[in-house]
């Protein structure tokens, strides 16, 4: 039950995160005109990854797409690439994770296959979240650099008679959406990976065979369990697949390939 909840929650968190990454990528407010300590203009500028917009004081807004590919800064191209990679990986991860959900039965899919798919989607979500966080952080760094450069230019003067006022840009709403969304996708991915560990059967579930020796009954179990030397029925060490709830003796079980995430 705990595994199903963890997997389901991981899926939902990742879904929200990826929706946020898509929203952030499409938003126009990656950078917005800095209004603090700046000569006040009657227009408000803001820019996204795909277009720049100007809002007149009347409320009329005009946006212009970046219709050039080669003329754009390499950093902007890199941010676009990171965000798109994040969205693509996230979308594939969502598709894979739908089939991996424990609550959804598809034919006679084995738990090991579901565990593999859960791990795959989890890794995809983690990489997707990291791509988004990296993209937003690169853009934010670019903004900070440009902000201080334009501030320096503002106060050093250009030597000529005409003063130039540079429009400085600061963090837009899309950056915060991107950071939060990337973080959520990352958390969702980690949750999927955790769920995968519980989903994976430790090994083939053989029926335990008891060999009765004289004296106490000693039950020999395959899979490296400690032999239990108790009398009567010993349920404590029965190898029953329980969806991840482990007994204290299972700690010494052989590691499965899914233990290392």
């Amino acid at each position: 039950m705990a595994v199903t909840a963890c997997q389901g929650l991981g899926f939902v968190v990742s879904l929200i995160g990826i929706a946020g990454i898509i929203a952030a990528t499409c938003m126009d407010q990656w950078s917005t005109q800095d209004l603090y300590n700046n000569p006040v203009t009657a227009v408000f500028n803001y820019q996204g990854l795909w277009r720049s917009c100007v809002r007149e004081s009347s409320g009329f807004t005009e946006c212009r797409g970046y219709f050039t590919l080669l003329g754009l800064p390499a950093m902007l191209q890199a941010v676009r690439a990171l965000m798109i990679v994040g969205i693509v990986l996230g979308a594939i991860g969502l598709l894979v994770s739908i089939f991996a959900l424990k609550c959804i039965r598809i034919g006679s899919m084995e738990d090991s296959a579901k565990a593999n798919m859960t791990l795959t989607s989890g890794i995809m979500f983690i990489v997707s979240g990291l791509c988004a966080i990296a993209g937003v952080s690169v853009f934010a760094n670019m903004l900070v650099t440009n902000f201080w450069m334009s501030t320096a230019n503002m106060y050093t003067g250009m030597g000529g008679m005409v003063q130039t006022v540079q429009t400085r840009y600061t963090f837009g709403a899309a950056l915060f959406v991107g950071w939060v969304a990337g973080g959520l996708t990352l958390i969702g991915g980690v949750m999927m990976c955790i769920a995968c560990r519980g989903l994976a059967p430790e090994e083939t579930n053989y029926k335990a065979v008891s060999y009765h020796a004289s004296g106490h009954s000693v039950a020999y179990k395959p899979g490296g369990f400690k032999a239990s030397t108790g009398f009567g029925s010993n349920t404590k060490n029965k190898k029953i697949y329980d969806g991840g709830a482990r007994t204290e003796d299972e700690v010494q079980s052989y590691p499965s390939k899914h233990d290392y995430v």
């Epitope: 227009v43 720049s52 007149e56 004081s57 009329f60 005409v162």
Partner: antibody
Framework: QVQLQQPGTELVKPGASVKVSCKAS????????MHWVKQRPGQGLEWIGR????????NYNQKFKGKATLTVDKSSDTAYMQLNGLTSEDSAVYYC????????????WGQGTLVTVSA | DIVMTQSPSPLTVTAGEKVTMTCKSS????????????LTWYQQKPGQPPKLLIY???TRESGVPDRFTGSGSGTDFTLTINSVQAEDLAVYYC?????????FGSGTKLETR
């Protein structure tokens, strides 16, 4: 068509106040900024400030802060500019002008109100 | 405040000739976001309010004759009247409508010889 109606003249005493009106018609009053401009006889134009009728948000020229107060009455589609502590320097023609939608220019102007400050 | 400097004033012309007046701003009026220059030209005839002629430095207001042409970018702007008519005799003002407070030039008076 757009019309901005202003009273022709206002005669006031020094130190007194005057409230100049500007009645708008022919367009949606709350959509566009209303600007006020001063022109002294034989002189150039000076922007006083502007007010957005929808929410009464306003911007003033620092020079006229404390001198001019802009208000609107949405029920009668009228903009007002109150001038306080009048001196001979305030004797001028005061225009109201409707802000354009696409740009920040002044698309339509009232005929102007001549405010004369005289004892 | 942004200072708008207009020249010449007055400008003496004869009907039918081409005239050019200039306007300089103390700071650039070009907004890089949309590559538009926030400079407006107005025409004021005696006893009348100003009339909008050109906005965004070069966009003619509807109803304005095409003999009026605005040009320039950044800090230097010009208004050209291709073939001056008698009804064009007026004072022409340029205005910064980018920075607050909006400021006007001192005007260029178009006079007949």
């Amino acid at each position: 068509q757009v019309q901005l109606q202003q009273p022709g003249t206002e005669l006031v005493k020094p130190g007194a106040s005057v409230k100049v009106s500007c009645k708008a018609s022919g367009y949606t009053f709350t959509t566009y900024w209303m600007h006020w401009v001063k022109q002294r006889p034989g002189q150039g134009l000076e922007w006083i400030g502007r007010i957005r009728p929808s929410d009464s948000d306003s911007n003033y020229n620092q020079k006229f802060k404390g001198k001019a107060t802009l208000t609107v009455d949405k029920s009668s589609d009228t903009a007002y500019m109150q001038l306080n502590g009048l001196t001979s320097e305030d004797s001028a023609v005061y225009y109201c002008a409707m802000g354009a939608y696409f740009s920040n220019s002044f698309a339509y102007w009232g005929q102007g109100t001549l405010v004369t400050v005289s004892a | 405040d942004i200072v708008m400097t207009q020249s010449p004033s007055p400008l003496t012309v004869t009907a039918g000739e081409k005239v050019t007046m200039t306007c300089k701003s103390s700071q650039t009026l070009l907004n890089r976001g949309n590559q538009k220059n926030y400079l407006t030209w107005y025409q004021q005839k005696p006893g009348q309010p100003p009339k909008l002629l050109i906005y965004w430095a070069s966009t003619r207001e509807s109803g304005v004759p095409d003999r009026f042409t605005g040009s320039g970018s950044g800090t230097d702007f010009t208004l050209t009247i291709n073939s001056v008519q008698a009804e064009d005799l007026a004072v022409y003002y340029c205005q910064n409508d980018y920075f607050f407070p909006f400021t006007f030039g001192s005007g260029t008076k178009l006079e007949t010889r």
